[in-house]
């Protein structure tokens, strides 16, 4: 049901694994502990998921309801411009760096924030239910 390329959207999917939240056609994992950006990415990949890639403003607004003031890592990095981990550019929201070390993106209830990738933060993974391959 959710088969396809790594960057397709889930179709109408069954329920999510334990400790994952179903929203729309995706499953989301909001971490309790904190890790740096790379370790957060590894955590998600090990669970057949990816650090959160937000597709549009609507998804961002919906997710922010579940967030607090605390920032969470998402799949956004500045490699000659802010891009999501699926390769798409950030084009529905703004994020700005205040220093050259702020090359990873995070989100809280108020919006996006650039940060040094070394800072330990909570993180959000996104996947299709179970082990399906369509991550975004």
């Amino acid at each position: 049901l959710c088969q396809g390329s790594n960057y397709s959207t889930c179709a109408s999917c069954p329920s999510c694994p334990d400790r994952w939240m179903k929203y729309g056609n995706h499953c989301y994992y909001f971490s309790v502990e904190e890790k740096d950006w790379n370790s957060s990415l590894e955590f998600c990949l090990a669970r057949d998921s990816h650090l959160l890639v937000i597709t549009d403003n609507q998804e961002m607004s919906l997710l922010q309801v579940f967030l607090s003031e605390a920032f969470c890592w998402i799949g956004l990095r500045n490699n000659s411009g802010w891009r999501w981990e699926d390769g798409s550019p950030l084009n529905f929201s703004r994020i700005s760096s205040n220093s050259f070390v702020q090359t990873c993106g995070a989100i809280n209830k108020n919006g996006l924030q650039a940060s040094s990738c070394e800072v330990p933060l909570h993180w959000v993974c996104k996947k299709c239910p179970f082990a399906d391959q369509a991550l975004f």
């Epitope: 920032f71 220093s99 070390v101 702020q102 995070a106 924030q113 040094s116 070394e118 800072v119 330990p120």
Partner: antibody, heavy 120, light 107 residues
């Protein structure tokens, strides 16, 4: 309350070495970039060194590169500055400073400073 | 390297005056500018980042403006405790350069 307390300053001869320490408290040391900034007597502020959270990345201006080494011990909440091949122009008050968080590299908190005098 | 130049290097003013200090960057630094206040024998105190955002606990009589190469720090109504030396600093990239300072003295 954020506290940064520098120590290790003193009188040293030209060509000599000195190690400064900065004991941090009141915040989670291992979440922040840390820096050293100095001020020669009667002069302005000069950035000396910055170290990343893990200590894996360090940055220096040309004036101290190859002579000064910044390091940190996150288990001891302590920042260090190893200074060698010291020159008269290194005479200054050395301040330890913490960034604003998330890699915002302005100097949000400062210690009281420790005086280094290089003279024969 | 980016150079930061402050003007004036010193100025005299009276309590209640409105004072403006200027900082000019040698090239476009967008809004990557911080301001600090330093009193004799004390460590600098952080006032403003990103050219205009006040640090926590800084009185509202302080304000920052500008972007690109020209920046200003304004004190709307000088208080006795404001007499000090003020420094601007480029905070985006290496090297983090400071202006030479502006000494604000009592007239």
């Amino acid at each position: 309350e954020v506290q940064l307390v520098e120590s290790g300053g003193g009188l040293v001869k030209p060509g000599g070495s000195l190690r400064l320490s900065c004991a941090a408290s009141g915040f989670t040391f291992s979440r922040y970039y840390m820096s050293w900034v100095r001020q020669a007597p009667g002069k302005g502020l000069e950035w000396v060194a910055t170290i990343s959270i893990s200590g894996g990345n360090v940055y220096y201006p040309d004036s101290v590169k190859g002579r000064f080494t910044i390091s940190r011990d996150n288990a001891k909440n302590t920042l260090y500055l190893q200074m060698s091949s010291l020159r008269a122009e290194d005479t200054a008050v050395y301040y330890c400073a913490r960034e604003g968080g998330y890699g915002n590299l302005w100097f949000a908190y400062w210690g009281q400073g420790t005086l280094v005098t290089v003279s024969s | 390297d980016i150079q930061m130049t402050q003007s004036p290097s010193s100025l005299s003013a009276s309590v209640g005056d409105r004072v403006t200090i200027t900082c000019r960057a040698s090239e476009n630094i967008y809004s990557a500018l911080a301001w600090y206040q330093q009193k004799p024998g004390k460590a600098p105190k952080f006032l403003i980042h990103n050219a205009k955002t006040l640090a926590e606990g800084v009185p509202s009589r302080f304000s920052g403006s500008g972007s690109g190469t020209d920046f200003t720090l304004t004190i709307s109504s000088l208080q006795p405790e404001d007499f000090a030396t003020y420094y601007c600093q480029y905070h985006y990239g290496i090297p983090f350069t400071f202006g030479q300072g502006t000494k604000l003295e009592i007239k």
